[in-house]
């Protein structure tokens, strides 16, 4: 049994890091493998992650971590029984994939303005809380070409757009994702999408 593709990990910079790797053949990850991880810090304890299958030869493990900060570095040991298959390290702050925003809501009752709001996925005491920026994707269910991205580079988790910038009388969907420049993160996954019917009063023409 050998590792074909070494583990690569990403952290949500809060409580979970996800590591994925591939074996050289079909593997029952949960029964044959264990990923041990330990913070390089005084008094830290070793933890064991039981991987799940991710395709025939692929494995994925969700590592639970407390109080993740930029100074943290973890040792990783991948074991098959008594055999050490791979040894490495992982610094969560250098491989951050933020959590997806939640609670995306479209408020349509504000005088021909659409107000989209969502929730920051981090608590206020997490460093990323004040450093997320967002991308909002709006698209028409009827017209695949009617697809747009709005970049929200301010901290407030909201976006206002004129309803008239979208077609009236049809349904739209929106979703939002986040990233943080400070840690050069990847984009988060998209939030679940929300749907609304866009209707507004056309301006009266003389």
């Amino acid at each position: 049994m050998k590792v074909l593709q070494e583990p690569t990990c990403v952290s949500d910079y809060m409580s979970i890091s996800t590591c994925e790797w591939k074996m050289n053949g079909p593997t029952n990850c949960s029964t044959e493998l264990r990923l041990l991880y330990q913070l390089v810090f005084l008094l830290s304890e070793a933890h064991t992650c039981i991987p799940e299958n991710n395709g025939g030869a692929g494995c994925v493990c969700h590592l639970l971590m407390d109080d993740v900060v930029s100074a943290d570095n973890y040792t990783l040991d991948l074991w098959a029984g008594q055999q050490l298959l791979w040894k490495g390290s992982f610094k969560p702050s250098e491989h951050v994939k933020p959590r997806a925003p939640g609670n995306l809501t479209v408020h349509t009752n504000v005088s021909d303005t659409l107000l989209l709001t969502w929730s920051n996925p981090y608590p206020p005491d997490n460093y990323l809380y004040n450093h997320l920026t967002y991308a909002v994707n709006i698209w028409s269910e009827n017209d695949p070409a009617d697809f747009r991205i709005y970049n929200v580079t301010y901290l407030e988790p909201s976006l206002r757009i004129a309803a008239s910038t979208l077609k009236s009388g049809i349904s739209y969907r929106a979703r939002v994702r986040a990233w943080a420049q400070c840690y050069n993160t990847t984009w988060s996954e998209w939030s679940p999408s929300t749907k609304w019917h866009n209707s507004y009063r056309e301006p009266f023409e003389q």
Epitope: F41, L42, L43, S44, E45, D66, D67, V69, S70, A71, D72, D125
Partner: antibody, heavy 116, light 111 residues
Framework: QVQLVQSGAEVKKPGASVKVSCKAS????????MHWARQAPGQGLEWMGI????????SYAQKFQGRVTMTRDTSTSTVYMELSSLRSEDTAVYYC?????????WGKGTLVTVSS | QSVLTQPPSVSAAPGQKVTISCSGG????????VSWYQQLPGTAPKLLIY???KRPSGIPDRFSGSKSGTSATLAITGLQTGDEADYYC????????????FGTGTKLTVL
Amino acid sequence: QVQLVQSGAEVKKPGASVKVSCKASGYAFTSYYMHWARQAPGQGLEWMGIINPSGGSTSYAQKFQGRVTMTRDTSTSTVYMELSSLRSEDTAVYYCARGKWWLYNWGKGTLVTVSS
Amino acid sequence: QSVLTQPPSVSAAPGQKVTISCSGGSSNIGNSYVSWYQQLPGTAPKLLIYDNNKRPSGIPDRFSGSKSGTSATLAITGLQTGDEADYYCGTWDTSQPPNPLFGTGTKLTVL
């Protein structure tokens, strides 16, 4: 919000022991290390040791080895610092502080006076 | 005796900028992360800067930190009378076993 509530001031005789408590609330107690530091009157901060509330393991500054004991009670989210063989130079304010590489939150401090 | 050396005192007028230095060595600041703590008179220390230059939420951007080699600096701009306090740098000594260190402390007086 996070709170670290420490026990009240103590007056002790030289040679005695003192046990200071620090009750934590507002966060997952076993997820954060707890440090103890002290500050003698008009002096700077001095680190004493650290406890991992999850397993109860400890590490102490060399200066206090053999005299200090840090424990925790997960049922009450409380950590304790006991200092024995007290001498006059142990008169100080003793602080508990939550954190790992740096100390996010501090208790208000407990004044321990050692006097004959 | 702390191996992190700070000036005993600094002073400046309201609105001015002041810097506080923290000098260490390769086994501490040079190989670890620096934090800064503010201790107002009669109160417990409060985290001001961590990870060399990051501010916890609620700390105004008048406070900033930097690190270069084996030294670190805390800068305070737009000084206010409420900033009058003792300031301590902190880091880890990477000897075995590792242990945290505090600086000697600096008393800031706002004239």
